[in-house]
Amino acid sequence: ASVGLPSVSLDLPRLSIQKDILTIKANTTLQITCRGQRDLDWLWPNNQSGSEQRVEVTECSDGLFCKTLTIPKVIGNDTGAYKCFYRETDLASVIYVYVQDYRSPFIASVSDQHGVVYITENKNKTVVIPCLGSISNLNVSLCARYPEKRFVPDGNRISWDSKKGFTIPSYMISYAGMVFCEAKINDESYQSIMYIVVVVGYRIYDVVLSPSHGIELSVGEKLVLNCTARTELNVGIDFNWEYPSSKHQHKKLVNRDLKTQSGSEMKKFLSTLTIDGVTRSDQGLYTCAASSGLMTKKNSTFVRVHEKPFVAFGSGMESLVEATVGERVRIPAKYLGYPPPEIKWYKNGIPLESNHTIKAGHVLTIMEVSERDTGNYTVILTNPISKEKQSHVVSLVVYVPPQIGEKSLISPVDSYQYGTTQTLTCTVYAIPPPHHIHWYWQLEEECANEPSQAVSVTNPYPCEEWRSVEDFQGGNKIEVNKNQFALIEGKNKTVSTLVIQAANVSALYKCEAVNKVGRGERVISFHVTRGPEITLQPDMQPTEQESVSLWCTADRSTFENLTWYKLGPQPLPIHVGELPTPVCKNLDTLWKLNATMFSNSTNDILIMELKNASLQDQGDYVCLAQDRKTKKRHCVVRQLTVLERVAPTITGNLENQTTSIGESIEVSCTASGNPPPQIMWFKDNETLVEDSGIVLKDGNRNLTIRRVRKEDEGLYTCQACSVLGCAKVEAFFIIEGAQEKTNLE
């Protein structure tokens, strides 16, 4: 057999045995002569080991460029390829010699050291265990252990070839720690050397670059790129980097394995690329490729190199931001710069600090914007290296959808006397101010829900037929006054007034305010009564534990069956902007109360007494009277508020003071509490008595001492007392100077 390509006018070496394969018996002599056209050499099996001492290569006696190879008493291990070649060329002739040695059918190394077979657990891969044979047609099986398994050639994927070894799908022996070949000759077993099975992985799960993106540097800075490959077990990784400036003087590559937790099913490898001082030519794409031999994965990142540090605002930086109350506002600081600038936000010149409502970073975030957030925000970018600063102002305008002030009050369900003139108001606060406030109305009976009707919490009225106030046919005569603008609680508000000339029919009125960001509405129940009137005795707003009487007075000739009710503990919910349920139409929500009837010449008076009123007594009280003729029920509703009892407190402190003789002292002692406390003054723990020089005013709140004398010096106490206790404050008044002798003395 010939090997290599012929070079100019050179024939292949010629062997004395013109065969590809030669089979000889053990213990015989092997002799082959090789002739050629220039200097020749021989290569033979195992010629790297000590066996060449038995091999003799001699020059031929009969000519130039001729060499004879002789091995006396050949053994099985001499099996293999014998090659005669021209020195320094690829031109060669090869013969494969089988030395049939039935005592040693496998070609073994001189020592019995373990061989190694590398396998992957890939189903499609085969592995060759190199147990070569000295006999070509042996019956060979493969033993794997532990547990011990034997594999026999199947004419398909499992086979043995004397020149190659035992071929088997690698997954079949991946469980094993060692394998060896076994041949049976005349019932005798012969074993090859042991081969240690080394499982080699190949799967690369991922390759991650860090930093992964947005890498920016300026000339002269150090670039450090980490490339981490995560692989299955038993994998070795080769890293390969591609980068713009391959001729870099200061480039350094360090590869290392990373320790993973014991029992982990994964390995990690790290390659670090370092360039000590980058130049503009180092800008570009950096690619890290990790290869396990059977698999390659790569990842790239772009590195930007700036000439010098800089900072500037990006073109998308806003100057005006509009938002509606309650929204989350995000104002990003859009910049171009390297290194990333320090970002500081200011509002109206005051630095902003992050807290739970505001985050001042690359993006200024206001979690729930409110009106007080309106203003000018300045963002200042500072380059951390050059200290160059850039500033930009963003105006934040916070819009407020219309809010109607009266809505925050408990919806009044008081009744209005027939024939009276009434004024209904809607006080609207909105930014920008409402571009219109419209009034609508509808009759109460069109909107009343019968007990049988289902009422949803969100819409307790089946009616939606609102009419414009210009169309007051069948209702009360209405006049809408021109909107007024008023500064209320420091805010510019729009007040819209609806005047009902004569309260003739019960109706519902709705004011609706609209601006560019929303709408607000308020529904007013305008219940007109011809009949009963409610008065409170002795006070409009009793304090808890005081007694109060609710008087319901009705004309005896018109009305009968006066009854007191209280709106039940769970009346229909009144949501902001929704209508209170007309109580006369829904007695199910009323609790009947005990009351005492009195009469005078014209009226019946039903008195409901609350002794020791408590906070639980607060609520809506209904007086119901029935028309003697028509039997129609008339209701009047009065809201009762019971003030909570509060122990006396004194607001503010009395200050110690030093005064000169003859001057005046004026001090104030403001006390609060319910019931209102009585104020008393003491000097040196004795009750202070008014005289010509000592004046107490405004229910003893203000104390004046005129033309002070030395004896006015002392400890002054203001004490505020009620049935719930006392509160006091003290101050020491020092009087300086000598007492002038008066003529009287």
Epitope: Q113, H114, P147
Partner: antibody, heavy 120, light 107 residues
Framework: EVQLVQSGAEVKKPGASVKVSCKAS????????MYWVRQAPGQGLEFMGW????????TYADDFKGRFTFTLDTSTSTAYMELRSLRSDDTAVYYC?????????????WGQGTLVTVSS | DIQMTQSPSSLSASVGDRVTIECRAS??????LAWYQQKPGKSPKLLIF???RLAAGVPSRFSGSGSGTDYSLTISSLQPEDVATYFC?????????FGGGTKVEIK
């Protein structure tokens, strides 16, 4: 009598290299592979790999691929273990060892160990 | 890789006591297990191979047993010269791994 004699202790700086030798006597050097085992201070034993002394073919355990190289000088019956790019966690005693026979992988003969200290 | 877990990590016993050290593998070893003794400042010394076969020159008070994943080394009568750290090693599957060691002391 089988003997494995290792080179003396070494102190190295991080990033440097070290080469530990193991000279064998009392048997035919090329008949048995040379195996390497590491023991960090106060820790257990870690198998590093081995070299076939007949073919010069090294085999490395997973954690010892890359920076470690096993080599031979058969003329002096000496095996070498070289470690490059030293790190502080490479501080350990490195042992060479030989099997009792070529059929079981237990270590019947051990060198006395070489302490490699990596410190800046 | 096969994980080898030794227990206890240390023990203290009196001279003459029977001492047993356990070694558990994460996989069946089919008795491909060796035991070593390492005295302070010295190299390890082979005691047992194939789970229960005594190495040449090792006193008969040392014995090994076990199969599957659980193996043990027993010193039938502890002697002062047995103070050492003992390691197990599996050679069923490459890479061959060692247990964490058991330090034996005399009370």
């Amino acid at each position: 009598e089988v003997q494995l004699v290792q080179s003396g202790a070494e102190v190295k700086k991080p990033g440097a290299s070290v080469k530990v030798s193991c000279k064998a006597s009392g048997y035919t050097f090329t008949n048995y592979g040379m195996y390497w085992v590491r023991q960090a201070p106060g820790q257990g034993l870690e198998f590093m790999g081995w070299i076939n002394t007949e073919t010069g073919q090294p085999t490395y355990a997973d954690d010892f691929k890359g920076r470690f190289t096993f080599t031979l000088d058969t003329s002096t019956s000496t095996a070498y273990m070289e470690l490059r790019s030293l790190r502080s966690d490479d501080t350990a005693v490195y042992y060479c060892a030989r099997l009792g026979n070529n059929y079981g992988i237990w270590f019947a003969y051990w060198g006395q160990g070489t302490l490699v200290t990596v410190s800046s | 890789d096969i994980q080898m877990t030794q227990s206890p990590s240390s023990l203290s016993a009196s001279v003459g006591d029977r001492v047993t050290i356990e070694c558990r593998a994460s996989d069946d070893l089919y008795s491909t297990l060796a035991w070593y003794q390492q005295k302070p400042g010295k190299s390890p010394k082979l005691l047992i191979f194939d789970a229960n076969r005594l190495a040449a020159g090792v006193p008969s008070r040392f014995s090994g047993s076990g199969s599957g994943t659980d193996y043990s080394l027993t010193i039938s009568s502890l002697q002062p010269e047995d103070v050492a750290t003992y390691f197990c090693q599996q050679y069923n599957k490459f890479p061959w791994t060692f247990g964490g060691g058991t330090k034996v002391e005399i009370k």
